[in-house]
């Protein structure tokens, strides 16, 4: 604005005004008159750039006239009152309403004063994120999907993760004319380590006060990964019973555990209890390879463990699991 004291009347308005598709919006426009300055406003005019004629006129004596009377309204101008506020309300915003508008005051004796306002027509998108459940493929596949539906302008989608991964983003026209639906896929080579981890889809849009964060919990289907725990190489004759555990990670969950040995069925001193194997005390040395076979919907995997029960004083050793 000009510095105080220059005496000129000035039209004040924002350079840009946002409005939402289908909603109403007010284009603010005011005449700033310095103290002591006399001015007389005879007419307010709104025109759209590139179009001939005026879309809205408020005349001191004739009042308002509109190119589309059902969609336009001077919010403050009244007959018989000083015309200082030319603010115009637009109803039922359409995509084609986006553009540059000129607000003009006809003042005397200062002359016509105008300002340009850019009306931005926005549509607030709806955002969803979902997991893409995958199996171990050995190659990159979409593992998460984030969709921002019906935005204007198109939303910006980014992914945040410690796992790496690559985005693949595309857009198509939305249901409402002028809107855009943005789809972003998060792509990675599936592995069991990724299963259950989170990635975050960040959606940014002019209509949001802050970015929207949507968390996706990744799902990788994989056959069991099996190991046997509970043996520390220090088992001796005469010790109490010990327990071995068949540790299995899988998705979906294991459906069955089967214990055996390389020689066939379990020996009498070994008792299967689901994922656990109870080893009873023995009175002679043993050297046996135990097998745990775990099954889930995707298959079966097994782990082997060679167990030795040696002669020696149990009191000197502490590696065995006791009940």
């Amino acid at each position: 604005w000009p510095p105080p004291g220059t005496g000129d009347v000035v039209v004040q308005a924002p350079t840009q005004v946002p409005g939402f598709l289908g909603d109403s919006v007010t284009l603010p426009c005011y005449l700033q008159v310095p103290n002591m300055e006399v001015t007389h406003v005879s007419q307010l005019t709104w025109a759209r750039h590139g179009e001939s004629g005026s879309m809205a006129v408020f005349h001191q004596t004739q009042g308002p006239s509109y190119s589309e009377s059902k969609r336009l309204e001077f919010v403050a101008a009244r007959l018989g009152a000083e015309l200082r506020n030319a603010s115009l309300r637009m109803f039922g915003l359409r995509v084609e309403d986006e553009g540059n508008y000129t607000c003009l005051f006809v003042t005397f004796p200062q002359g016509s004063r105008s300002v340009d306002i850019w009306l931005r027509v926005l549509a607030k998108p709806q955002n969803t994120a979902e997991v893409q459940k995958v199996q171990l493929t050995g190659e990159p596949v979409p593992m998460a999907r984030c969709v921002s539906t019906g935005g204007r302008p198109p939303a910006q989608i980014t992914w945040h993760s410690d796992l790496g991964g690559m985005p693949n983003t595309s857009q198509v026209p939305g249901f409402l004319s002028g809107t855009v639906t943005v789809t972003s896929l998060w792509i990675l080579v599936p592995s069991s380590q990724v299963d259950g981890k989170n990635v975050t889809c960040k959606v940014e849009h002019e209509s949001f006060e802050k970015p929207q964060l949507l968390t996706v919990n990744l799902t990788v289907y994989y056959p069991p990964e099996v190991s046997i725990s509970g043996y520390d190489n220090n088992w001796y004759l005469g010790q109490n019973e010990a327990t071995l555990t068949c540790d299995a990670r899988s998705n979906p969950e294991p459906t069955g555990y089967n214990w055996s040995t390389t020689m066939g069925p379990l020996p009498p001193f070994a008792v299967a209890q689901g994922a656990q194997l109870l080893i009873r005390p023995v009175d002679k040395p043993i050297n046996t390879t135990l097998i745990c076979n775990v099954t889930n919907a995707l298959g079966a995997r097994q782990a082997e463990l060679t167990v030795q029960v040696k002669e020696g004083p149990p009191s000197e050793h502490s590696g065995i699991s006791r009940n």
Partner: antibody, heavy 121, light 109 residues
């Protein structure tokens, strides 16, 4: 054709009042700003007041507040100026002028021929 | 009230460029004074030439132009013609009233 037709010369006595008229044609009167100016013989111009014909809104030179009163009659597209408590100092030619717009600014566009007022006892 | 001062008389020759100025007693003339220029020819024939400092009225020859030069308003006639011989008044706006200058008698010899 745009015209401002002013009333004829007036010879008036000190202390009296006079009402000058300015009949317009050829333009939209109700959207017009009309100023009244004073010119003493061989001297410069002095602005008295303006009026917006559409509403009758006025603005006066402080010097003439209480001395001059400007009005309009939209039905006849005529502007008036009444001068009261006349003295010999008020002897002058009085012009009505329609302001025209260049878009960005206003100018003194259409001038009446002037009305000579002589104040004499 | 402010006093507006103009050259009392100027002489120029046909085809020459002449500049008339308009000074304000209150300080520099600015665009917020909306300087007007009016031409008076014999028999009180008035023509508005310029409004709002530099806006030429419709129908006024392009040789007439308004501007601000230094702290004054100016009317420049580029290529004066004999018919430009007249008295030229400037008028300045002071927030709520116009003040006219004393006029410049321009002679084109």
């Amino acid at each position: 054709q745009v015209q401002m037709q002013q009333s004829g010369a007036e010879l008036v006595k000190p202390g009296a009042s006079v009402k000058l008229s300015c009949k317009t044609s050829g333009f939209t009167f109700s959207s017009s700003y009309i100023s009244w100016l004073k010119q003493k013989p061989g001297q410069s111009l002095e602005w008295i007041a303006w009026i917006y014909a559409g509403t009758g809104d006025t603005n006066y030179n402080q010097k003439f507040t209480g001395k001059a009163q400007v009005t309009v009659d939209t039905s006849s597209s005529t502007a008036y100026m009444q001068f009261s408590s006349l003295t010999t100092e008020d002897s002058a030619i009085y012009y009505c002028v329609r302001h025209g717009s260049t878009g960005r600014g206003w100018y003194f566009a259409v001038w009446g021929a002037g009305t000579t007022v002589t104040v004499s006892s | 009230q402010a006093v507006v001062t103009q050259e009392s008389a100027l002489t120029t020759s046909p085809g020459e460029t002449v500049t008339l100025t308009c000074r304000s007693s209150t300080g520099a003339v600015t665009t917020s004074n909306y300087a007007n220029w009016v031409q008076e020819k014999p028999d009180h024939l008035f023509t508005g030439l310029i409004g709002g400092t530099n806006n030429r009225a419709p129908g006024v020859p392009a040789r007439f132009s308004g501007s601000l030069i230094g702290d004054k308003a100016a009317l420049t006639i580029t290529g004066a013609q004999t018919e430009d011989e007249a008295i030229y008044f400037c008028a300045l706006w002071y927030s709520n009233h116009f003040v006219f200058g004393g006029g410049t008698k321009l002679t084109v010899l």
